[in-house]
């Protein structure tokens, strides 16, 4: 039912908007698709979420949306913004989720972003950032996500990560990103979701997963490593792992020894030559293991200590006889 | 608590073996780096070499890579440094830290002192 | 091998005053904006204590009195007002490319 309150509240519904009490006594605004080129003025000082994304938006003047202290979610996704200055959230002391994706930024808002303390969720992505200074995320200690993907970064921006421990998911992915230095996350040990699919990476440095002590996904899928990601060995707790359509040539002995908490690995549309006996031993909680299009296999895989795989895929392989213990070692 | 522990002090002759042992408690073994470091009487310290506990890779100093050996044993959490042709010269206390941020060593073992006389 | 010079060798500073030690690598140590440079403390009989990574970070648990800074070759701790229990050897450490290197090491004293 509706009080005297969320009366007040809809009454400070911005034209054209849509409205609704979000159960707290606050009001979510909805101004998506309505071709604005500007900010509504008239916003209520109690809107906790407003969705102005899918408009004609070209520039923020500074401090647009002044005492929005209860806002806890700004979406601004789908605008022609080209740069966003400094205070264009000043007051937002609330705010959790910044939606910036697909617009036309060229660098990350450094000056705007600081002194957004309770900022959880940033995103970034489809926009044409080249650059990330090393200070822009300084502020941002409650950050927990963030999307860079779909732009235009070289290089990891190795400092400006640095300063996001308590960082839990993160994609990089659709860049043209092409090495990937020692302790490039070194600060990141609270990431558990990284993605840096489709770049353009022929290079690992040897430790640069070092410090990534809570990883469990990790997506190198769409990439140009021609060696396997021996790299992956310090990360204990990763389940998921993807490196397919790459040009890895071979999968070591005892390729995932440090891996013992992987569940699937994807690894197909590679040209490998040969895998090592030993690669998938001892890894108990293997569901799926896929080896599609690795033509040169002769040998079927020793698989001791790995005997919870609920598919195993080997297409395209020349193996001509399977060990006689093959049915002992699957369940 | 992280902790590092390491083995008694060792009396050897020249040209034996020594093998000292670092046991690690407080963290997961598997996940960081131990570095081996010695430090000569009086002098300073020389990195000999790593390894990292969950794959069993290993990194030597190219000075020491003929005469190192450098283990581990998850089972237990302990890595161990075998030094072989000992010489009058390798006495030193002999270190293992954790490799941490960044590969600083933020934790170190209480040392290990080798004697290598005749 | 990347060779690590500190200057001074000895250093006597009276309580409460500043103390500054040099590091000098033979090459840069920087890599992606990283600074691979260590700073320990070592007192007698006891094994060394991490003060500072990545040339400027303070590890934790180490009194703000110390501070790291610099970048490629040159580096310095900083002990903005020395304490009794300061007296101690100090290194600097590069961990930039192996071998890992120290340098010869600093005895800072009282004056």
């Known amino acids: 039912g509706s009080s005297p309150r969320s009366g007040v509240l809809l009454r400070g519904c911005p034209t054209h908007c849509h409205c609704e009490p979000d159960g707290r006594m606050l009001l979510r605004v909805d101004c998506s698709d309505l071709g604005l080129s500007e900010l509504p003025s008239n916003l209520s000082v109690f809107t906790s979420y407003l969705d102005l994304s899918m408009n004609n938006i070209s520039q923020l003047l500074p401090n647009p949306l002044p005492s929005l202290r209860f806002l806890e979610e700004l979406r601004l996704a789908g605008n022609a913004l080209t740069y966003i200055p400094k205070g264009a959230f000043t007051g937002l002391y609330s705010l959790k989720v910044l939606m910036l994706q697909n617009n036309q930024l060229r660098h990350v808002p450094t000056e705007a972003l600081q002194n957004l303390r309770s900022l959880q969720s940033l995103r970034l992505d489809a926009n044409h950032i080249s650059y990330v200074p090393p200070s822009c995320f300084s502020g941002l200690h409650s950050l927990r996500h963030l999307w860079l993907d779909d732009n235009a970064l070289t290089e990891i921006p190795v400092q400006a990560f640095r300063s996001l421990s308590a960082l839990q998911a993160m994609t990089l992915a659709l860049n043209k990103i092409h090495h990937i230095p020692d302790y490039a996350f070194g600060n990141l040990s609270s990431l558990v979701v990284l993605h840096l699919h489709n770049n353009r990476i022929h290079s690992l440095g040897k430790k640069c997963f070092d410090g990534l002590h809570s990883l469990e996904t990790l997506d190198l899928n769409y990439n140009n490593l021609d060696e396997f990601p021996t790299a992956i060995r310090t990360l204990s707790n990763l389940k998921e792992l993807g490196f397919h359509s790459n040009n890895i040539r071979s999968i070591p002995e005892k390729a995932f020894v440090g891996n013992p908490s992987l569940i699937t690995i994807h690894f197909y549309d590679n040209p490998i030559q040969f895998v090592g006996r030993s690669a998938f031993q001892h890894l108990p909680e293997l569901r799926t293991l896929t080896l599609n299009g690795a033509s040169q296999i002769t040998e079927f895989p020793d698989l001791t200590g790995t005997a919870n795989l609920e598919s195993l895929t080997l297409t395209g392989a020349q193996i001509s006889s399977l060990p006689q213990t093959v049915c002992n070692q699957l369940p | 608590e992280v902790q590092l522990v390491q083995s008694g002090a060792e009396v050897k002759k020249p040209g034996a073996s020594v093998k000292v042992s670092c046991k690690a408690s407080?963290?997961?073994?598997?996940?960081?780096?131990i570095e081996w470091v010695r430090q000569a009487p009086g002098q300073g310290l020389e990195w000999i070499g790593e390894?990292?506990?969950?794959?069993?890779?290993?990194d030597y100093n190219e000075k020491f890579k003929v005469r190192v050996t450098i283990t581990r044993d998850t089972s237990t959490s302990t890595a161990y440094l075998e030094l072989s042709s000992l010489r009058s010269e390798d006495t030193a206390v002999y270190y293992c830290?954790?490799?941490?941020?960044?590969?600083?060593?933020?934790?170190w073992g209480q040392g290990t002192l080798v004697t290598v006389s005749s | 091998d990347i060779v690590m010079t500190q200057s001074p060798d000895s250093l006597a500073v009276s309580l409460g005053e500043r103390a500054t030690i040099n590091c000098r690598a033979s090459?840069?140590?920087?890599?992606?904006?990283?600074?691979?440079m260590h700073w320990y403390q070592q007192k007698p009989g006891q094994p060394p204590k991490l003060l500072i990574y990545?040339?400027?970070n303070l590890e934790s648990g180490v009194p703000d009195r110390f501070s790291g800074s610099g970048s490629r070759t040159d580096f310095t701790l900083t002990i903005s007002s020395l304490q009794a229990e300061d007296v101690a050897v100090y290194y600097c450490?590069?961990?930039?490319?192996?071998?890992?290197?120290f340098g010869q090491g600093t005895k800072v004293e009282i004056k």
């Open positions: 407080g963290y997961t073994f598997s996940a960081y780096w």
């Open positions: 450490q590069q961990n930039y490319e192996d071998p890992f290197t």
């Open positions: 390894i990292l506990p969950g794959s069993d890779s290993t």
């Open positions: 830290a954790r490799g941490g941020h960044y590969g600083s060593l933020d934790y």
């Open positions: 090459e840069s140590v920087d890599n992606y904006g990283n600074s691979f």
């Open positions: 990545l040339a400027s």
